[in-house]
């Protein structure tokens, strides 16, 4: 058998007066009882109606009844003020049954043809109610053939009576320190047959305060206390209520951090309910007094549990807890009414004693030993031998606690040694040279380490020399014995320096010519600059104008003299620069391989010979006087030359330093 609803058999038909369409007889009484299935009603209308008209249809009539109720008593052909004829009206049973009674009296003044009616069963729309009648369903009504059902809006559930919608209003938990709660639908009437539970649950230490606001309207009874609908408030200490009626209950200070509110309604009534505004309080913490030179934020009348404040110091003051600095400070009020942290101090920023400046000094400008906010100090370098690098030396103690220069630098200024100072103003000779006097060549460095070589001091912790002079020690820098500040090669009175690292030009190939014959030695400590120890300057871009052919340079060293021995005293010689092509040609013939003289070299010496550098001078500086700055600079490095020093037609060959300025600057800045 097919599944699905079993539809009722159709109910429909025709009714007519006896003898219709002929006239009806006197003294007739005929009754029809029509029945429709449950959930259905009967519809009836007349296609013909012709009965004797009488006052209130006392004589002949058709009576329609449904249950105990008379729906209509009909007679005549057309309705009058006191009698009704059906006309085009349709009649409906109130339930599923309809009784039709036809009666004629003992006489008719003229013949009447009676009536013809048709009926049918139709579904009752239970969802349609007459004005003033209670709705079938609380919320939504759904009609269907033979019946109906109710459903509820979200937040409600259908009561077991299948018509009422009870509110789903339990289990709400309020955890904020203040808020509002109300009966469902407030301020519209609250739902029937509902039981609502609301919880306010705050952190321990808080106390909930309840205020009833706006209006209060809960169904009541004149004699019995809230028998229908009621509101109750429960804490861990006591119960308040029940409440009903139209009077706003008083404020309730629960002295509890947890509150349960219960609201119960019955099946009847039409009341707007209630609204509660709740707040909370707690034991206040002591009022925070800002420390001197600080302020509290936010400012409140009182601070209770979970409230917090921060301390902000004025510019130039810092948060300190004892000696320990804080970037920020926030205290939180605890449930016992105490702050979780003690108040810090706002102490004036103290930059502390300024760091010592190597080769310089510091002077307190604001006052002796004053190192606090806005204090001023002045750094300066030791005169004559040091100069301050791009800095005016003035530093101010700023709010961040650092000594800061006018350019915003927090690092110390740098005292750079003054370069190129010499006691000497005129020339002499080495190979065919003469003795140097104190302060003539204060950049001169004696390098011992297997062989005797020379170098020139750069800044206060670098030595410029020839690659071939230190090649063997490139992996053992500590083997180099570096001496300076002396004229006598064998004197015990000198300033000792040690090497930290040796940097040989990557383009230098040992035993394959002398191209790129340049090296730097980094000293493991800075040397103290004085009149006997002063660095040589590196050439400026404009230096080539002082190094043209025939310009005089000066070479110095302890190398071989004309007697064939290493010089005991530092010797020097003034020699002219030789035309590069002339020098190249001089070394084109055997035993020199072609291309011995490169663009990275310069030559100096006399065509007639007699003045030259020699073995033992290697790595030393060929220096020139910059007449604009009146400082000496290194133009060449003693590199190589003829087998016989000072030979006529041959020249001393020097590494051309100006070609290596980027290389030198990179090494020094990187290391």
């Amino acid at each position: 058998t097919p599944l699905g609803p079993k539809w009722p058999e159709p109910v429909f038909g025709r009714l007519a007066s006896p003898g219709f369409p002929g006239e009806y007889a006197n003294d007739q009484e005929r009754r029809w009882t029509l029945t429709a299935p449950p959930g259905y009603r009967l519809r009836l209308y007349f296609t013909h109606f012709d009965l004797e008209l009488s006052h209130l249809c006392e004589y002949d009539f058709v009576k329609l009844s449904s249950g105990a109720k008379v729906l209509a008593t009909l007679c005549g052909q057309e309705s009058t003020d006191t009698e009704r004829a059906p006309g085009k009206d349709t009649f409906y049973s109130l339930g599923s049954s309809l009784d039709i009674t036809f009666r004629s009296d003992y006489s008719n003044e003229k013949p009447f043809t009676g009536f013809e009616a048709f009926y049918a069963a139709e579904d009752i729309d239970e969802c349609q109610v007459a004005p003033g009648e209670a709705p079938t369903c609380d919320h939504h009504c759904h009609n269907h053939l033979g019946g109906f059902y109710c459903s509820c809006r979200a937040g409600y559930v259908l009561h077991r009576n299948k018509r009422t919608c009870s509110a789903l209003c339990s289990g709400q938990v309020f955890t904020q320190r203040s808020g509002e709660l109300s009966s469902p639908e407030y301020p519209r009437p609250y739902p029937k047959l509902s039981s609502c539970t609301y919880s306010i649950s705050l952190e321990e230490g808080f106390s909930v305060i309840l205020d009833f606001v706006e209006s209060f309207d809960v169904e009541t009874h004149p004699e019995t206390l809230c028998p229908y609908d009621f509101l109750k408030i429960q804490t861990d200490r006591e119960e308040h209520g029940p409440f009903c009626g139209k009077t706003l209950p008083h404020r309730i200070e629960t002295k509890s951090n947890t509150v349960t509110i219960t609201f119960v309604t019955d099946e009847s009534g039409d009341h707007t309910g209630w609204k509660i505004h709740y707040t909370s309080t707690a034991q206040p913490c002591p009022y925070p007094m800002a420390p001197p030179n600080g302020h509290v934020s936010p400012v409140q009348a009182k601070y209770i549990l979970k409230d917090s404040f921060s301390i902000f110091c004025e510019t130039g003051y810092e948060l300190l807890q004892g000696h320990l600095p804080l970037k920020s400070f926030t205290a939180v009020c605890q449930k016992d009414g105490s702050w979780d942290r003690p108040m810090p101090a706002c102490s004036i920023v103290d930059c502390g004693p300024p760091d010592d400046l190597p080769s310089g000094r510091v002077e307190y400008i604001t006052g002796p030993g004053v190192t606090t906010y806005k204090a001023v100090i002045q750094y300066s370098c030791e005169e004559t031998f040091y100069t301050m690098k791009v800095n005016d030396g003035k530093y101010v103690c700023e709010a961040d606690g650092f000594w800061t220069s006018s350019k915003g630098e927090k690092s110390l200024p740098v005292c750079e040694p003054v370069c190129g100072l010499s006691a000497r103003t005129t020339g002499g000779q080495i190979y065919g040279g003469q003795k140097a006097k104190p302060g003539d060549f204060p950049w001169q460095v004696l390098i011992l380490g297997g062989t005797t070589a020379a170098g020139a001091l750069l800044y206060d912790n670098w030595v410029l020399t020839a690659a071939h002079a230190v090649y063997e020690q490139k992996h053992d820098a500590s083997a180099l014995d570096i001496r300076m500040g002396t004229l006598k090669r064998l004197s015990p009175h000198y300033t000792q320096a040690w090497s930290e690292a040796v940097f040989i030009h990557e383009g230098y190939t040992h035993d394959a010519g002398f191209d790129n014959d340049i090296a730097l030695i980094k000293l493991n400590n800075k040397v103290v600059i004085n009149s006997n120890i002063t660095p040589i300057c590196l050439p400026r871009k404009e230096a080539e104008s002082f190094m043209r052919t025939d310009d005089i340079g000066t070479a110095s060293g302890w190398g071989l003299t004309q007697r064939g021995f290493l010089a005991r005293n530092l010797m020097y010689v003034d020699i002219p620069i030789v035309d590069h092509q002339k020098c190249t040609a001089a070394y084109e013939k055997p035993p020199y391989p072609r291309g011995s003289v490169t663009a990275n070299m310069l030559c100096a010496g006399l065509e007639s010979g007699g003045k030259d550098s020699c073995r033992g001078d290697s790595g030393g500086a060929l220096v020139f006087l910059d007449s604009e700055t009146e400082r000496w600079f290194v133009g060449g490095i003693v590199s190589w030359g003829s087998m016989n020093c000072g030979e006529a037609g041959q020249y001393g060959v020097y590494t051309k330093v100006i070609n290596y300025i980027p290389w030198i600057e990179n090494i020094i800045s990187d290391f």
Epitope: G322, H323, L324, P325, K327, S328, D400, G401, F402
Partner: antibody
Framework: QVQLQESGPGLVKPSETLSLTCTVS?????????WNWIRQPPGKKLEWMGY???????SYNPSLKSRITISRDTSKNQFSLKLSSVTAADTAVYYC???????WGQGTLVTVSS | DIVMTQSPATLSVSPGERATLSCKAS??????VAWYQQKPGQSPRALIY???YRYSGIPARFSGSGSGTEFTLTISSLQSEDFAVYFC?????????FGGGTKVEIK
Amino acid sequence: QVQLQESGPGLVKPSETLSLTCTVSGYSITSDYAWNWIRQPPGKKLEWMGYISYSGRTSYNPSLKSRITISRDTSKNQFSLKLSSVTAADTAVYYCSRHYGDYWGQGTLVTVSS
Amino acid sequence: DIVMTQSPATLSVSPGERATLSCKASQNVGTNVAWYQQKPGQSPRALIYSASYRYSGIPARFSGSGSGTEFTLTISSLQSEDFAVYFCHQYNANPLTFGGGTKVEIK
């Protein structure tokens, strides 16, 4: 969870420089507080050596001022201790800690011996 | 330097009893004092800061009091895990200094 971890050589020769690093996790050293180095020679009491603050400022124990440097590497969230010219008296367990000691490293023993 | 003097050097207490440890500063340090517990081979553990503020996670049996030059750490009812060395520490002035410690041992 804030954690501090000291690292560095356990043996240093006299006259050399002792170098230790404290790596901080769970909190940025630039966010707040002072970051301390504290040491404890065997059987002796704790000695505060110095701190570097959230801003990079330093404060040193005057007894060590000529030998101590505290620096930081904010990219690695580390701060470091350098103590120069060490002697046997510098043998101790070295701790790094935050502010007034709410968090400490586990400590590292440094022995100064040739 | 501010000297922090702890007394007694050793305190013998039975479990469940109260222990009172004293720390005296040679100068006024306000309330800038912390207390630490140290067990052998371990780093110190912070108990109290600012003389009387207990760190979170520290049992309520530990309490600190005092200000100025006299400070006290009280352990209301000693548990077996409380037997250790306790240090006080002032952070009021440079250099920060520590007390010599009080060893709390089982009686």
